[in-house]
Interface confidence: low
């Protein structure tokens, strides 16, 4: 029952507690148990015992084995078990099953990945993380003290995250890693009409001749995952990829934000050099889903240079 | 991911016919206009024919016209190259290529195409 | 038919030169070109769209430029995974959506 299961890798820092607690005043004595050989305290050693902690700095893979670690209080002594286990450093990326630390579930509201084990550790900032062996980058991923945040969560962001950081012990230096996996979960979503939130009904947008102008269909469908929801324009009401302009052309790829927790959908149309025969078209910004369709119509107007008289 | 993957090529006589297929993953493919682009053993890329996203409308290379025939099957996320009358010349690798911003963003492997008696 | 004309069509340069292609289609009127970088036995790659932009992923050593009839693509400190055929790319901005595609240039090692 008091046992507890440890793992590290080779040439890495690995910090064990003991699986039974006791008050910081009472003595705690560390054992091999193969051996019933006690565990030095003195840090010079590579691997010495610190009141509940273990220590291994670094670790061997001939370090693995179970060690016998007795409380000791005035009245009474508990004994616990740490089962540890040291690997060889994966030449590969895949991090196999044994070495990896609990999953943790996370969704659009709530996406920290805390870092196993790290409170064991002394350890200073930066901490570093990785999903599925590459650096993370980008505005998305926040390290946050001992957790990763992930703004956005998408479920392409499930996978196995590893964090890596260094333990100090008197001046010296010790990497660590650590990994686990993360799943997203859905939200409970739902469904409505489309709501069109860019261009207005009837918008018109000035725009100069000669020059290239933008048009943005957004559009929201509910909250969650849309199994059916799409934006796109319609010009005189013929599909962008039919009507045989090359000039104008839709964003392909749709971009799906979440505006207060809505799922919404962009759509541009990039119109190159406009011409005079472009003010004359009907601009349909369509958004559908299983509700329904709504469409928002826009014109272009010429947009007047200002005359500068003498 | 976006992925192109060609089949049905392989070695025909002159005259002949061959039907290229390329099943796309990854996009939603009803909405891209595709494109065959062929290149010769050793030499450059040629232009061969391309079709709106919905299938409407229809263009060839001057080389092609009236031999090949472009279609797509938006259903099952597909474009089609139907080859008829196939000479010599029309030997090479054939390519199908999404069109994206006024250029081709994504390309399947090749299918080889060999015309000989 | 109208061609782009690609030059030159072939080139040797060494790792950390400064490489520039260029690409022509006076015929054409306005257009836009794209470029794309081809190695043995594999299908080309997207390196440039509608004349300067570059697609994500591709390194900020390649760019575009030009308008009208003539196009660039610079290649500004050769890499040792950047010997390879180069293609320029057109398609007019008016009128039927053809593809035009240059000659190629093939970059090889000095």
């Known amino acids: 029952k008091f046992s507890k299961q440890s793992w590290g890798l080779e040439n890495e820092a690995l910090i064990v507690r003991c699986p039974r607690q006791g008050k910081p005043s009472y003595t705690v004595d560390w054992y091999y148990s193969q051996t019933n050989k006690s565990i030095p305290t003195q840090e010079r050693n590579r691997v010495f015992a610190s009141g509940q902690l273990l220590k291994f700095l670094p670790a061997a893979v001939a370090d693995s084995g179970i060690y016998t670690c007795i409380v000791r209080s005035p009245t009474f002594n508990r004994t616990g078990y740490a089962n540890v286990t040291i690997y060889k450093k994966q030449s590969d990326c895949n991090v196999p099953d044994y070495l990896m630390y609990s999953t943790v579930s996370g969704s659009e509201k709530n996406s920290k990945i805390y870092c196993p084990t790290i409170d064991l550790y002394n350890w200073t900032a930066p901490l570093e993380w990785f999903k599925n062996c590459q650096a993370l980058q980008g505005s998305r991923y926040r390290a946050h003290k001992s957790f990763l945040v992930i703004d956005n969560v998408m479920t392409e962001d499930a996978g196995d995250y590893t964090c890596k950081f260094i333990h100090n012990e008197n001046g010296a230096n010790y990497s660590v890693t650590a990994t686990r996996s993360f799943t997203v979960k859905d939200e409970q979503g739902f469904s409505l009409f489309p709501v069109i939130g860019a261009p207005a009904q009837n918008e018109i947008k000035e725009v100069e001749i000669g020059k290239n102008a933008n048009l943005t269909c957004s559009a929201c469908f509910g909250k969650g995952t849309q199994f059916l929801a799409a934006v796109l324009w319609q010009l005189n009401g013929t599909k962008i990829t039919d009507f045989g302009e090359p000039r104008i052309q839709q964003e392909e790829g749709q971009n799906q934000s979440f505006s207060n927790g809505l799922a919404c959908l962009d759509m541009v149309l990039r119109i190159a050099d406009v011409k005079e025969e472009d003010l004359l078209l009907q601009y349909d910004c369509l958004a559908l889903n299983l509700h329904g369709l709504r469409r928002h119509t826009v014109r272009l107007s010429r947009k007047n240079p200002i005359d500068h008289h003498s | 991911e976006v992925q192109l993957l060609e089949s049905g090529g392989g070695l025909v006589q002159p005259g002949g016919s061959l039907r290229l297929s390329c099943a796309a993953s990854g996009f939603t493919f009803s909405r891209y206009a595709m494109n065959w682009v062929r290149q010769a053993p050793g030499k450059g890329l040629e232009w061969v024919s391309a079709?709106?996203?919905?299938?409407?409308?229809?263009y060839y290379a001057d080389s092609v016209k009236g031999r090949f025939t472009i279609s797509r099957d938006n259903s099952k996320n597909t474009l089609y190259l139907q080859m008829n009358s196939l000479r010599a010349e029309d030997t090479a690798v054939y390519y199908c290529?999404?069109?994206?911003?006024?250029?081709?963003?994504?390309w399947g492997q090749g299918t080889l195409v060999t015309v000989s008696s | 038919d109208i061609q782009m004309t690609q030059s030159p069509s072939s080139l040797s340069a060494s790792v950390g030169d400064r490489v520039t292609i260029t690409c022509s289609g006076d015929r054409l009127g306005e257009k836009y070109v794209s470029w794309y970088q081809q190695k043995p036995g594999k299908a080309p790659k997207l390196l440039i769209y509608e004349n300067n932009n570059r697609p994500s992923g591709v390194p900020s050593r390649f760019s575009g430029s030009g308008s009208g009839t003539d196009f660039t693509l610079t290649i500004s400190s050769l890499q040792p995974e950047d010997f390879a055929t180069y293609y320029c790319v057109a398609r007019a901005v008016r009128g039927n959506p053809h593809v035009l595609f240059g000659q190629g240039t093939k970059v090889e090692i000095k």
């Open positions: 079709i709106s996203g919905s299938g409407g409308n229809t």
């Open positions: 290529a999404r069109v994206w911003r006024n250029s081709l963003d994504y």
